[in-house]
């Protein structure tokens, strides 16, 4: 030690005072003012502490720094001076900031700055909020799903940025002077159905359902395989053609040709098509009958029953597909001598006559139509030759009392039996499938090849028989009128028809053909 | 005394394959026309197909066709039914069966069926 | 294709009872509808063809009627060994087509 000297052993931030003691520097601070061992300590005095004396004055926040301080401007103040620090509250010129001004952009969209003393707020515009996470970032308000149910229970509510609309539910429209999109909007249900606005295929019929609509399959008709039915895309097709086949236990190459055109038919079938549709069956049944092929080759009852399954079906089909078509007068024929008379009209009270090469029929419109039926009114006529291959040989069962007649007035049957079929066969059919007993009769009046003398001319029906197949009945026709080529017919109910020439050896005089027929 | 015995039923994954057969006697098998009818457990009769009497005709209802095929062996008096593409509403006893000659076509005769059970 | 309708579905009887079943044709067809009668575990019997004929065997209690749309069996007096369940078929068109059944059970 240097009795006059300084103490080399002051410690750290202190300075020596002599060669024995040592006094802390400025701003610095020791447990006594003056050291005298190596062992005390200078620390930082905190300026900064609340209880010190030094003031920084307003808008500035004082930073304690190693052995001193600093006065600086509060974050969003800055100091008029430009000095970025200073020591007491005479030096400061802390003022605000403007960040609104220096920042246009400081709110990011959606919001609008607002300057505060030292800082700013981003108030938020109309359908928006601040962002608990970020306050100064505004974010869009959800209406729809923030409980406030702006929206009236007959629409749905559409969150758009800043916004929302009240737009009507699918299938819905705006009421009458109501708006769609603003809160104030109420919708009603839209009938798709008579608006045209649905998308049903024309094989189905359209009902309406709250909220949409939908699809379901036409009267006689039945879904698509493996399409449901009472949707939008239903698909539907005609159960006349799916039900007309083979008849179960009938083999024939050509019989399964001809069903398999009739149902390619139904499968592309729609109600636009029933003209083509009705045209291509009577073109493929002409075909089928000017060459039966293998037909031929079956037992006779079995092409009975054929005749018996074509004569059927066509009726059905026709009748069914005929409902489609517009108003008017419709009148086919084909090569080998089928023709098809159709008359379709909304009922009217007068008198029908259909006429063709080979047979007239006449009738009242108003047996065309079953009451309640809203369709059009149809009747119908087909002459088709090419079934008399079919039909030989096919029995005549007479009734009772006829039959009795018979055998009592005539010399009985001639040996070969069987009735010859002088006429076309005729099928005729109405939109009303009940004619079994018309309230006023039809009239028939057939052109047919020479009757030989001394025989007997009938007027007869096919009669569906009890196994499905048939024979010529003449139960509830009468023959009016004969003469060599041709007969007139009056019969209470519809069916097919022709007029038969049966091996009767008659009389000169014939006492009893009025009872007869 | 007519006599018709089906064989080769049994249990297959759905998927696969079976061959029924129905052995026929006691009438002139060649005359016939053949169907099989099948019936799920407790429930109703299903047609299945049908066969003519010289085997060149034969009909199925939508829910079998393409994946099975009736065919006959006039010379054996055998009905065979092959099945593919079996799923589980296939499982049935599989009863053959004779019919009446047309027109009346009911079908008079059947044997005492063949269990065929389709599952995993 | 043609829906055949059969009701009832099940019925009771005693022995001696009349019993009508009948099956709903969806459309005509004509008379080609037969009646079947099985057994549990045993393959079905033909008791009636084409809608009123009855098979060779079988008694004259069991009788058919109709033609078009619908079609009726009926037992004219139950006997015992008549209980089991009863089935219509049309073959007028393909394809062939059932009933879906009716069961008759002893009360």
């Known amino acids: 030690q240097d009795s006059r000297g300084c103490a080399r052993w002051c410690p750290q931030d202190s300075s020596c005072v002599n060669a024995t003691a040592c006094r802390c520097n400025p701003g610095f601070s020791s447990f006594s003012e003056i050291i005298t061992t190596p062992m005390e300590t200078c620390d930082d005095i905190n300026e900064c502490a609340t209880l010190s004396k030094v003031s920084c004055g307003k808008f500035s926040d004082c930073w304690n720094t190693e052995g001193s301080y600093d006065c600086v401007c509060s974050p969003g103040y800055e100091p008029v001076s430009g000095a970025k620090t200073f020591k007491n509250e005479s030096e400061n010129t802390c003022q605000d900031v403007d960040e609104c001004q220096q920042n246009p952009r400081l709110c990011k969209s959606y919001g609008t700055c607002v300057n505060t003393l030292g800082s700013y707020t981003c108030q938020c515009l109309p359908g928006f909020k601040l962002k608990p996470e970020d306050p100064k970032l505004c974010t869009d308000v959800n209406e729809c799903t923030s409980g406030q149910n702006p929206c009236h229970s007959s629409t749905h509510c559409l969150n758009n940025v800043g916004s929302y609309q009240c737009r009507c539910r699918p299938g819905w429209q705006p009421i009458p002077g109501s708006p769609n999109g603003p809160n104030n909007t109420v919708c009603e249900d839209v009938d798709e159905c008579s608006s045209g606005q649905h998308q049903c295929d024309s094989s189905t019929v359209c009902f309406n359902t709250v909220g949409s609509y939908s699809c379901r399959c036409r009267p006689g008709w039945k879904p698509r395989h493996g399409i449901p039915n009472n949707q939008k895309d239903t698909v539907c097709e005609d159960m006349t053609f799916s039900t007309w086949t083979p008849p179960p236990g009938v083999h024939s190459q050509t019989l399964s040709r001809f069903f398999d055109k009739v149902q390619d038919l139904g499968r592309d079938y729609k109600p636009g098509l029933a003209n083509n549709t009705i045209q291509s069956i009577l073109q493929a049944l002409d075909e089928l009958l000017e060459a039966p092929g293998d037909l031929e080759t079956l037992p006779r009852l079995q092409q009975h029953c054929v005749a018996s399954h074509l004569l059927d079906g066509l009726e059905d089909v026709l009748r069914g597909l005929s409902k489609n078509l517009s108003n008017g007068l419709l009148n086919f024929s084909y090569p080998a001598g089928t023709e098809l008379s159709l008359e379709v009209q909304k009922q009217v009270d007068r008198s029908v006559t259909l006429r063709q090469n080979q047979a007239v029929m006449q009738l009242d419109w108003n047996q065309a139509q079953k009451s309640g039926d809203p369709g059009p009114s149809v009747v119908g006529l087909v002459s088709i030759p090419g079934m008399g291959k079919l039909l030989a040989e096919a029995p005549l069962v007479l009734e009772p009392e006829k039959q009795m007649l018979l055998h009592e007035t005539h010399q009985g049957l001639l040996q070969d039996g069987s009735p010859i079929l002088l006429s076309d066969v005729i099928s005729a059919f109405l939109s009303n499938n009940d004619t079994q007993n018309l309230s006023s009769p039809v009239t028939f009046t057939f052109s047919h090849r020479s009757v030989i003398p001394r025989q007997k001319v009938l007027c007869v029906f096919w009669e569906h028989g009890q196994n499905g197949c048939g024979h010529w009945a003449t139960t509830g026709c009468s023959t009016i009128g004969t003469r060599d080529t041709s007969t007139i017919c009056r019969c209470t109910h519809l069916s097919s028809f022709a007029v038969l020439m049966a091996h009767y050896d008659v009389q000169e005089e014939d006492p009893v053909l009025t009872v007869i027929t | 005394e007519v006599q018709l015995v089906e064989s080769g039923g049994g249990l297959v994954k759905p998927g696969g394959s079976l061959r029924l057969s129905c052995a026929a006697s006691g009438f002139t098998f060649s005359s016939y026309d053949m169907s099989w009818v099948r019936q799920a457990p407790g429930k109703g009769l299903e047609w299945v197909s049908t066969?003519?009497?010289?085997?060149?005709?034969?009909y199925y209802p939508d829910s079998v066709k393409g994946r099975f095929t009736i065919s006959r062996d006039n010379a054996k008096n055998s009905l065979y039914l092959q099945m593919n593409s079996l799923r589980a509403e296939d499982t049935a006893v599989y009863y053959c069966?004779?019919?009446?000659?047309?027109?009346?076509?009911?079908?008079?005769?059947w044997g005492q069926g063949t269990t065929v059970t389709v599952s995993s | 294709d043609i829906q055949m309708t059969q009701s009832p579905s099940s019925l009771s009887a005693s022995v001696g009872d009349r019993v009508t079943i009948t099956c709903k044709a969806s459309q005509n067809v004509r008379t080609t509808v037969d009646w079947y009668q099985q057994k549990p575990g045993k393959a079905p019997k033909l008791l009636i063809y084409?809608?009123?004929n009855r098979h060779t065997g079988v008694p004259s209690r069991f009788s058919g009627s109709g033609s078009g749309t619908d079609f009726t069996l009926t037992i004219s007096s139950l006997q015992p060994e008549d209980f089991a369940t009863y089935y219509c078929l049309q073959h007028r068109n393909y394809p062939l087509t059932f009933g879906g059944g009716t069961k008759v059970e002893i009360k």
């Open positions: 084409l809608a009123s």
């Open positions: 066969i003519s009497s010289g085997g060149n005709y034969n």
């Open positions: 069966a004779r019919h009446y000659d047309y027109p009346d076509y009911a079908m008079d005769y």
